[in-house]
Interface confidence: medium
């Protein structure tokens, strides 16, 4: 067990062109905060899966108003730390996406108004209980800059906190079986502990929160008796003629789902679907807040009015659930007229329409290029009885109204995976690769593998170039 | 039905070495931490090495430290006890043990014994 | 090492009668993060290898009759037979698992 800990250093306009308008305004006050989702592994999964190994989400910054006519500076950022607690092992090697959210303070009725300014993503490795990792991401013409790290809770050690310290017994060992556990020189590699709810009699582990089962038996607690091949039926009686193992009731005879979770039989064990407000392998923890980042997928967590709803995950469009954590097959809905090609892209819908039509849902027939404009600058092509348009650089669609898909370029180097997003795009970076494009080699010790200084600039400060 | 059958033992001079094995079936070898515990003629219980299930960890009591090797062979289902710089101390009758689970748990099944005797 | 101390070191018992046997630890065996203790008891009947009867120190192992049970925490322990029967003759052992593996010195238990 241990904890990441994240902490943003500054969030602002990025160098170059194209600055942002300032998100508050002096009509329109409002203040930031940010939220952390951390998986295992270096994934692939798409940016709405599960955080597996957490999520959390900041206090809210101090108000901030726009001066007018001032360009947007590094917006005033919440105190603290973002942490986001995990019961079992560090892996190693995760995938991150932070968000960026504003919080309006005008006059809106039903109160403030949330939006999400920027979402940054990225893959790293990193060991738990090494020093601080400073990284820099932009979002479209945003920059954040933070650090990350991670490290164990006692009694956990070790660079991936499977390692069980305890104080020593005796001033000068260590047992025999309780090996030093260094770098704590006063304290010993103790016994580990189990998976919660592990079987005592049934079940034991060999790494921290585990629960492997003796012979005989299964489920993710052990608890579940195992009928032997014998067996023609597996909820039949014991019997000293088939040679089977008791079996006992199905994995949901009695409900095993407490809090009123409702119990579905899985191939294996049983599946404890939770209400609100609860959540564990059998629904037995109670207590989740907003601070415990349980929306997925950008919801919004606000704090339920009454003891029975502990929180309310607000969801952004294409998302439902408790926890926003379903998305919503919105093209099942056929919302492409003519033949056209549904895309939903979470944010929003789009239609590929078929040549020959356009319109947001290809709901225009388009016969030539009599009468009909390209938008953007581009010019009208004609054949085959419909029109088509050549679009400018950075347009695209039937008319060239659709901006160009921000990856179709690939601008993600070193194999670095590209997320659309309408704020630009994100990209995931590969193994040992950092940058905005992936585009810096991450050296073992933590160093970025940088181009040479320019004059009077020190190397190896990631901050002044990326 | 769990069998563990030790083989190996006999007589040797001291300074000498001796391999004991033991033969495992009626359960997932690989499954299970795996311990040696001897017992001195007319004499208790002491607890001698110990190896965890990948055969990635090995925890020996003070006594043997240095003289003794645990190892197995999941393939085979067999455990070891390699014992050099053998003394007269070290006479007793060695049994291979199964522990529960993993190395924290308690022994839940025990063979025979072979008896080693260390004896000029 | 965990030095484990039983008592008495020979018991006397008539047919029928309770059977209290006493395990001491040189420290608590008690492993604070999942509260348990890690301690088991044993059987050794002549000739044969030890039986487990009790584990967790109070858990007691698939097929064992119910008259054996174990209680206590952290150092002090105790095996209790409720009915003794002739079949329990034997030498009884503790054993700590949590610090390395020791045994306590056996207790032997006769009928009276």
């Known amino acids: 067990a241990g904890v990441f800990e994240l902490q943003i250093h500054s969030f602002g306009p990025g160098p170059g062109p194209g600055a942002p308008r300032s998100p508050c305004s002096a009509r329109l006050p409002c203040r930031l905060f940010f939220r952390v989702c951390l998986k295992p592994g270096l994934s692939e999964e798409a940016a709405e899966s599960p955080c597996a190994l957490g999520a959390a989400l900041s206090a809210r910054g101090p108000v901030y108003t726009e001066q007018p006519g001032a360009p947007a500076p590094d917006l005033p950022l919440p105190d603290g730390l973002l942490q986001v607690p995990f019961r079992d092992a560090w892996p190693g090697t995760f995938s991150f996406i932070i968000e960026t959210w504003r919080e309006e303070l005008g006059d809106q009725i039903g109160g403030p108004a949330w939006s999400l300014l920027a979402r940054v993503a990225g893959r790293r490795r990193l060991a738990a209980g090494g020093p601080w990792a400073r990284d820099i991401q932009r979002a479209g013409a945003w920059e954040l800059r933070f650090s990350y790290r991670a490290r164990c809770e006692p009694p956990a050690v070790g660079t991936a906190c499977t390692r069980l310290c305890r104080p020593r017994s005796a001033p000068s060992r260590c047992g025999p079986g309780l090996r030093p556990c260094a770098p704590l020189e006063d304290e010993c590699e103790a016994p580990l502990v189990c998976r919660a709810g592990c079987s005592p009699e049934h079940g034991f582990c060999e790494q921290p929160g585990e629960c492997r089962c003796l012979e005989g038996w299964t489920g993710p607690l052990c608890t579940v008796p195992v009928s032997t091949s014998s067996c023609l039926s597996p909820r039949g009686p014991s019997s000293a003629t088939t040679g089977c193992l008791v079996p006992g009731p199905g994995p949901c005879d009695g409900n095993p789902c407490a809090n009123g979770g409702s119990c579905s039989e899985t191939p294996r064990s049983f599946e404890c679907t939770c209400p609100r407000g609860f959540y564990g392998l059998r629904c037995e923890v109670s207590g989740v807040t907003c601070a415990d980042g349980p929306c997925f997928n950008g919801g919004l967590c606000v704090g339920g009015a009454d003891p029975d709803s502990a929180y309310i995950c607000h969801c952004p469009p294409g998302f439902q659930g408790s926890n926003c954590e379903k998305r919503v097959d919105r093209c099942s809905l056929q919302p492409c007229r003519n033949g056209g090609l549904c895309l939903d892209l979470g944010h929003a819908l789009r239609c590929r329409c078929r040549a020959g039509f356009a319109g947001p849902r290809c709901e225009h027939d388009l016969d030539d290029c009599a009468g009909r404009a390209c938008a953007n600058g581009g010019t009208c092509v004609e054949g085959g009885g419909a029109h088509r348009c050549s679009c400018a650089l950075g347009f695209g669609g039937r008319d060239c109204r659709e901006r160009a898909d921000p990856c179709a370029a690939r601008p993600c180097a070193h194999g670095g995976r590209c997320y659309a997003h309408f704020s630009g795009l994100v990209c995931a970076c590969a193994p040992g690769y950092m940058g905005a494009r992936c585009e810096f080699p991450v050296h073992p010790d933590g160093a970025s593998a940088l181009p040479a200084a320019p004059p009077g600039l020190r190397p190896g400060d990631p901050q002044r170039y990326l | 039905q769990v069998e563990l059958v030790e083989s190996g033992g006999g007589l040797v001079q001291p300074g000498g070495s001796l391999r004991l094995s033991c033969a495992a079936s009626g359960f997932t070898f690989s499954s299970y931490a795996m311990s040696w515990v001897r017992q001195a003629p007319g004499k208790g219980l002491e607890w001698v090495a110990a190896i965890n299930s990948n055969g990635g960890n090995t925890y020996y009591a003070d006594s043997v430290k240095g003289r003794f090797t645990i190892s197995r062979d999941n393939s085979k289902n067999t455990l070891y006890l390699q014992m050099n710089s053998l003394r007269a101390e070290d006479t007793a009758v060695y049994y291979c043990?199964?522990?529960?689970?993993?190395?924290?748990?308690?022994?839940?099944?025990w063979g025979q014994g072979t008896l080693v005797t260390v004896s000029s | 090492d965990i030095v484990m101390t039983q008592s008495p070191d020979s018991l006397a018992v008539s047919l029928g009668e309770r059977a209290t046997i006493n395990c001491k630890s040189s420290?608590?065996?008690?492993?604070?993060?999942?509260?348990?203790?890690?301690l088991a008891w044993y059987q050794q009947k002549p000739g044969q290898p030890p039986k487990l009867l009790i584990y967790w120190a109070s858990t007691r192992e698939s097929g064992v009759p119910d008259r054996f049970s174990g209680s206590g925490s952290g150092t002090d322990f105790t095996l209790t037979i409720s009915s003794l029967q002739a079949e329990d003759v034997a030498v009884y052992y503790c054993h700590q698992y949590l610090s390395s593996r020791t045994f306590g010195q056996g207790t032997r238990l006769e009928i009276k």
């Open positions: 043990a199964r522990h529960r689970g993993g190395f924290y748990y308690a022994v839940d099944y």
């Open positions: 420290q608590s065996v008690l492993y604070s993060s999942n509260q348990k203790n890690y």
